[in-house]
């Protein structure tokens, strides 16, 4: 099981001193956002028990494996469900703590109930403040059952759940009808996926017989040990005030684990620390009792004394849970509770024993989970013990499980079970990812998803040119860093594969799938220079350039021209896709703009050095529109136009241009120049009779200006069809005289 503990500090007189701490004993726990160690998460779960919103809780990380939640301002902030999530990948585990208000109408006799599949669970809510009304039971926030207030038994409301199944697991609550939900008794029911003493997919495997209140995990058969106990079967007590799978953590504060609730991964749930009991874990065990919640009885024999933290302390000459075993009986010594090997390895396992008479090589045997017995190949005899060494045949996955070392002498026998985990070396499921490439190097991310078991100790990157039969080059890298493959050939495809390893002998996995990564072309090295440029209009620029003469073929695919408009902070890029080109026309530029211009050679996606920049000023655009354009029919073929000169002219007008179009006509408009810029009137002749025309005009200085407003006018009468409009211009006064 994942080594994850959620600690609740139950000093309830002052909610501001209340805190929850989640502690992980996992290697690399909580390291953060990389794929090798997701962070610890600690939060209040408001999906089932909703409390009034308050100020946000404060989360503080203390190193890589601890996170603390504080900032509770009032007792109601504490009521409800809290969860801590830790562990990586398939081992990601959620630990849940349920907090009850000590002032609630109903209080749970026991908060966490762990039962086996098919058992009957009984939840008991004790009346703390009586109300003469129905009691509503809920499961995961939804209605479940109702009891009449007369149905209380000895001041308790009982909910019987016969033949429970795993889906029955969850948060249960008992509430008086019309009472605040915060006054409810909250419970946590954990239903193991198997019957008592069984585990595994079909519940076919036998649990190791967890001691000291440990609970057998229905998925992996491991004992989840109560706080303060360790070992494969929870057979060993930690020193007072310590907890964690290896007793590596220490309770904070001078009073040790007093006032702390410990929550562990399911199917354990929550309890007080070893040596403490009561709803707030502040009462020491009564004489003769020990362990978490003081649930265990010592029953020491042969003069043993009861320690409320560890159980029986045996006098010299005796050992065993109840001091029932004489030291003359052989005893397995210092056997590791858990060993880990890689698949298909052939490890050596040692088992040491002592006793009177002294154990010899033949009296120590090793039993595999399938019942196969291995005899030791050699033994080392020392004054105080005999160590037998066993050569294990090639390991298969079925060898995972509980192995047993057994010693038998005429003085008796002893055995010690230990867990063997056969791990599958990791195999990448995907190819490495190309991050960036250059002509002679590739930057690769080796982090890929994998099958098999972690943690990843080393990553090897194998690479060689595509279709090559030469040996693979190999680089060993840190799992969390990107790799740069250097000294490669330009414009060459390389086959790249990842190989992952986990700790231990035989931990190297098979190579992952290959991927093709291609180095970039050689960088173009020639620097062009600008020969010249000339303006072909207010928005058009012709540019020419040259390249130095060098022997051999030109390394380049084309040219990139860049125009930088510093005023507007805009860059215009023009791609010339022929490496032979030495001139280009740039159009659609902004009139009156000062540009910085340069040119550079490109090859594939790589740019060569830019030419020294040139500075170009485009002429401004044309003048503003003429004002107050007016049309007046003079005859059946003539219309007179009058206007006023544009305002704020940047220079002298060179001419006006009139646009003539038949209203609603589909043909192209006709443009007529008025070459005498001082004029403010002109007559358009040769128009058709009784025809409606549209007119607009613009002035020209260096370039054409903006169009005026459009005016409409119809010719008079019904004269002959004209050949087409022509223009005659006069001073306005002269036209009026006529």
């Amino acid at each position: 099981a994942v080594d994850l503990t959620l600690l609740a500090n139950l000093r309830l007189t002052d909610p501001q001193r209340f805190f929850l701490t989640c502690v992980s004993g996992e290697a690399g726990a909580g390291r953060g956002s990389d794929a090798w160690g997701p962070p610890l998460l600690l939060e209040k779960d408001d999906r089932i028990v909703r409390t009034p919103p308050g100020p946000p809780l404060r989360l503080a990380r203390n190193g890589s494996h601890q996170v603390t939640l504080r900032g509770f301002s009032k007792p109601s902030d504490l009521v409800g469900v809290f969860s801590c999530v830790g562990g990586a990948g398939a081992r990601r585990t959620r630990v849940i703590y349920v907090h009850n208000s000590p002032g609630a109408h109903l209080l749970p006799d026991k908060v966490t109930h762990t039962v086996n599949k098919g058992d009957t669970a009984v939840l008991s809510a004790r009346v703390h403040k009586e109300k003469q009304t129905d009691v509503i039971w809920k499961s995961n926030g939804s209605y479940f059952y109702t009891l009449d207030w007369h149905e209380a038994q000895d001041g308790r409301f009982l909910l019987q759940l016969p033949n429970v199944q795993p889906p029955s697991s969850g948060i249960y609550s008992a509430t008086y009808l019309e009472a605040s939900p915060l006054g409810s008794a909250f419970f946590r029911l954990i239903v193991r996926g198997c019957g008592a003493g069984r585990w595994g997919p079909g519940c076919t495997k036998e649990c190791p017989g967890c001691l000291h209140g440990g609970v057998c995990h229905d998925h992996d058969g491991e004992c989840v040990c109560p706080p303060g106990f360790t070992g494969t079967r929870c057979e060993q007590a930690c020193r007072e005030g310590r907890f964690g799978q290896s007793c590596q953590e220490q309770c904070p504060g001078i009073s040790g684990c007093r006032g702390l609730t410990f929550c562990l991964p399911d199917p354990y749930g929550c309890s007080c620390g070893s040596g403490w009991r009561g709803s707030q874990c502040q009462e020491a065990c009564a004489p003769g009792h020990f362990g978490a919640d003081c649930r265990l009885q010592c029953q020491c024999q042969n003069g043993g004394t009861c320690d409320r933290f560890s159980g029986c302390v045996c006098p010299s000459g005796w050992h065993g849970v109840h001091c029932e075993k004489s030291d003359r009986i052989p005893q397995i010594l210092n056997m590791a509770s858990e060993l880990e090997f890689n698949l298909e390895t052939m490890p050596r396992i040692n088992c040491a024993a002592a006793g009177n008479p002294f154990p010899v090589r033949g009296s120590i045997e090793l039993r595999k989970p399938d019942g196969t017995v291995l005899l030791s190949t050699k033994a080392i005899v020392e004054p105080e013990k005999t160590t037998a060494e066993f050569e294990v045949p090639r390991l298969v996955l079925a060898d995972s499980g509980f192995w047993e070392c057994r010693v038998s002498t005429s003085g008796g026998q002893d055995s010690r079970r230990f867990k063997v985990n056969v791990k599958v070396p990791p195999v990448p499921l995907a190819a490495p990812r190309l991050l960036t490439k250059q002509s002679r190097q590739l930057v690769v991310s080796p982090l890929v998803s994998f099958s098999g078991d972690g943690p990843i100790s080393t990553v090897r990157l194998h690479y060689r040119p595509q279709d090559s039969t030469m040996d693979w080059s190999t680089i060993v890298v840190d799992p969390s860093e990107n790799v740069t493959l250097m000294n490669l050939r330009p414009k060459t495809g390389y086959s790249v594969r990842v190989q992952l390893s986990r700790p231990g002998e035989g931990g190297e996995g098979a190579w992952g799938p290959p991927t093709l990564m291609t180095t970039d072309c050689p960088e173009p090295l020639l620097q062009p220079w600008l020969e010249g440029w000339h303006v072909e209009g207010t928005d058009r620029l012709r540019v020419s350039w040259s390249l130095p003469l060098v022997p051999g073929p030109l390394v380049g695919d084309g040219f990139l021209l860049r125009l930088w408009d510093g005023t507007r902070g805009q860059e215009r890029r023009e791609n010339v896709s022929s490496p032979q080109a030495r001139t280009a026309l740039l159009t659609g530029l902004t009139p009156g703009t000062h540009y910085q211009l340069d040119v550079q050679l490109y090859h594939c996606t790589l740019l060569g050095p830019a030419s020294p920049p040139a500075h170009v000023l485009l002429p401004p655009s044309g003048p503003p529109a003429p004002r107050h354009l007016h049309a007046q029919a003079l005859s059946d073929s003539e219309i007179q136009l009058t206007w006023k000169h544009p305002e704020a002219l940047p220079g002298p007008i060179s001419k006006y241009v009139v646009e003539v179009q038949v209203a609603g006509g589909a043909g192209d408009p006709l443009w007529i120049d008025v070459d005498r810029p001082e004029e403010t009137s002109t007559i358009i002749r040769g128009l058709n009779a009784s025809t409606r025309y549209l007119f607009r005009m613009r002035a020209s200085i260096q370039g054409l200006g903006d169009w005026s407003n459009t005016v409409e006018e119809s010719t008079l009468g019904n004269g002959l069809q004209a050949e087409g409009p022509v223009q005659e211009s006069r001073a306005a006064e002269e036209g009026l005289d006529q």
């Epitope: 509503i136 809920k138 939804s142 209605y143 007369h150 149905e151 019309e178």
Partner: antibody
């Protein structure tokens, strides 16, 4: 589909007996308070009796106390009303109703069964 | 026993009208009151529970309110399908008691 189906109604003489049944489906019958409500022809609704999920606690209207008995068989998902010493004023449509989870509104009703007490 | 006095016993209104039915309890019953709708020849159906709570699937034009022991049931904009008899019911004390009912018709 959540459903209640009453049966057992009919014509009975004053002083006679009748047993009504109500078959429940579509929900966990054994978890809910159940009740009987009646409605005399052309009149309003009158609550008759209720029974808690365990069957251990029952309540009755004064007008039927001592004559009617409510019971349930959770293994058969069935509610019963045993009516003895029937009177003409017991003539009504009898509805079986579920009392909603956590509240006391009758959230599911049967279609009703007619009981006529007449000589 | 708690008496529930419902008024009026019948009322006629036009489509789109705002309709209000009242119910008075003889004792304090807190919010422990439900409103039911019964259409002719059908079983009753709960519309509002706990004096205010609109049941799932009930149109939002229905609402309930309370002032002391006086409860009101309102239909904001009467629709033809709202023709029915409406009952209030207290569940504060056993025996649970219903009002006499209000028969609602369309003009």
């Amino acid at each position: 589909e959540v459903q209640l189906l009453e049966s057992g109604g009919g014509l009975v003489q004053p002083g006679g007996s009748l047993r009504l049944s109500c078959a429940a489906s579509g929900f966990t019958f054994s978890h809910y308070i159940m009740a009987w409500v009646r409605q005399a022809p052309g009149k309003g609704l009158e609550w008759v009796s209720r029974i808690y999920p365990s069957g251990g606690k029952t309540y009755y209207a004064d007008s039927v106390k001592g004559r009617f008995t409510i019971s349930r068989d959770n293994s058969k998902n069935t509610l019963y009303l045993q009516m003895n010493s029937l009177r003409a004023e017991d003539t009504a449509v009898y509805y079986c109703a579920r009392q909603g989870g956590g509240g006391r509104a009758f959230d599911i009703w049967g279609q009703g069964t007619m009981v006529t007490v007449s000589s | 026993d708690i008496q529930m006095t419902q008024s009026p016993s019948s009322l006629s209104a036009s489509v789109g009208d705002r309709v209000t039915i009242a119910c008075r309890a003889s004792h304090d019953i807190s919010d422990n009151l439900n409103w039911y709708q019964q259409k002719p020849g059908r079983a009753p159906k709960v519309v509002i529970s706990d004096a205010f709570n609109l049941e799932a699937g009930v149109p939002s034009r229905f609402s309930g309110s309370r002032s002391g022991t006086y409860f009101t049931f309102t239909i904001n904009s009467l629709q033809p399908e709202d023709v029915a008899t409406y009952y209030c019911q207290q569940f504060n004390n056993v025996p649970y008691t219903f009002g006499q009912g209000t028969k609602l018709e369309i003009k």
